[in-house]
Amino acid sequence: KNLKSPQKVEVDIIDDNFILRWNRSDESVGNVTFSFDYQKTGMDNWIKLSGCQNITSTKCNFSSLKLNVYEEIKLRIRAEKENTSSWYEVDSFTPFRKAQIGPPEVHLEAEDKAIVIHISPGTKDSVMWALDGLSFTYSLVIWKNSSGVEERIENIYSRHKIYKLSPETTYCLKVKAALLTSWKIGVYSPVHCIKTTVENELPPPENIEVSVQNQNYVLKWDYTYANMTFQVQWLHAFLKRNPGNHLYKWKQIPDCENVKTTQCVFPQNVFQKGIYLLRVQASDGNNTSFWSEEIKFDTEIQAFLLPPVFNIRSLSDSFHIYIGAPKQSGNTPVIQDYPLIYEIIFWENTSNAERKIIEKKTDVTVPNLKPLTVYCVKARAHTMDEKLNKSSVFSDAVCEKTKPGNTSK
């Protein structure tokens, strides 16, 4: 009886693993083996595919073959018993184009309200991604084990920290890699779960802001308790993009080491032009907090985007706010030749309930106020350029009393 050629050959490539699967043409014929040949572009001769000769199953692995992954390759298969079937040719393919990115390796660390995720490619020193290894980005799906409600986080790098979690809670996540340059999305990792720790005695500092005063940067933050010491560290933001780097060499800001106030002042020349990350930690001498959330700090933007200066004209039921250019040292106004949008926050002095107004104009009316009531106002500027999505810090709050009820506009 003539042997039929195997059919439906599938080539699966994940990272550096090359797997072939096919269907037997005739299930009734026993003891059949299968063999593959391959042919490179521009070659006439066929070469035996090592790892895929005289195979009794319908799957074989030819990962050991050292191929140029960017070069087209053609495969053919035949069945063998006493005689052989005719060859069945598989459509030619380029390994790199066909390859999928495998599941990344994931390693988790827990704090009380945060999880650190270390991600590395599933195949170390992969040949397939040798030219693209630096371009991997990752995305993840995370959920509370108890609820299953998923949150997606896109475009993260090899080390990522998720904040604002609950203590003593199990979170699960899965991660996949992407090579956006090649339009490739990878396979999800297995699910990894970790339980956040018991709540730390000391919370991390919050609401870190940088502003410019004279030739100095002023770094401010909020803290729950008094009589603490703080330290501030910085890191070049680009280091986060280095996929092989899990050691972030955070550096101390000398003027912000063991400070006893919730702010520190350091010269602008501490930082060269660039984008940095800053973080703050609190200590009471016995216990230490975990590090605060990291804030991004761009020296270029910080240098020019100063909080707005404004005057208030008080009426009985409203404030008229006139926004002017911020002042530098020596009381000279700063010329800001790019469009700004202003965020104005106001609140009744005796209340914490804040209201917000967003305006492009430099004269703003704050309506619906009560007469003879003290209201406080603070403002900040935002750039309108999407690429330069930056904000100044808030100005100091200015508090004014509205006029009695009979005042007309």
């Epitope: 390693h107 988790l108 660390e109 827990a110 704090e111 009380d112 270390h118 970790i194 720790t197 018991v198 730390n200 005695e201 780097n245 899990h246 050691l247 972030y248 060499k249 550096k251 101390q252 016995n286 216990n287 230490t288 975990f290």
Partner: antibody, heavy 118, light 107 residues
Amino acid sequence: EVQLQQSGAELVKPGASVKVSCTGSGFNIKDYYIHWVKQRTEQGLEWIGRIDPEDGETKYAPKFQGRATITSDTSSNTAYLQLSSLTSGDTAVYYCARYDGYYCFDYWGQGTTLTVSS
Amino acid sequence: DIVMTQSQKFMSTSVGDRVSVTCKASQNVGTNVAWYQQKPGQSPKPLIYSTSYRYSGVPDRFTGSGSGTDFTLTISNVQSADLAAYFCQQYNNYPYTFGGGTRLEIK
């Protein structure tokens, strides 16, 4: 193969100084932190301090601050631990270890025995 | 400084048994804890990092667990080769600190 090779045993007199070396092979010390750890006979491990060989930045345990100095020479891929004003309490084995922010102290030197005796 | 306390200086066990070495931190160190094995005359050998991750080549008889302030190294199916001292270490905050060590003796 990654290795940390430490200098040989030292016998020094009280009050003197000593400098122990730790040379990395199979990796570039600039990409890591190099830590030093002390172990007295039949005792536990004590962290002395660490260096970032990339810029020479150091951290020390308060107990060793002022008497221990950690330096490095990236051209020879070597880190050093110098101890001054030695006393018999400094008699111990000193280890260097590599830290990469992920695997903690994944490789250790073989140890350098320091004996302080008159 | 964070104090790492290994309350048991010595533990005695038999081949094939399961033994747990404990370590308590004086404050929350997250999961930044490592375990080392040290045999007489040798350098410490890394076993576990980040509380529960085994270094490559470490048998899966060694498992780490815990978080916050309480940590455990469990050795199941103890072998005579496991006769050694075991140290925990926190690397959450400077100065990094080690536990005093637990010496495992085989009956």
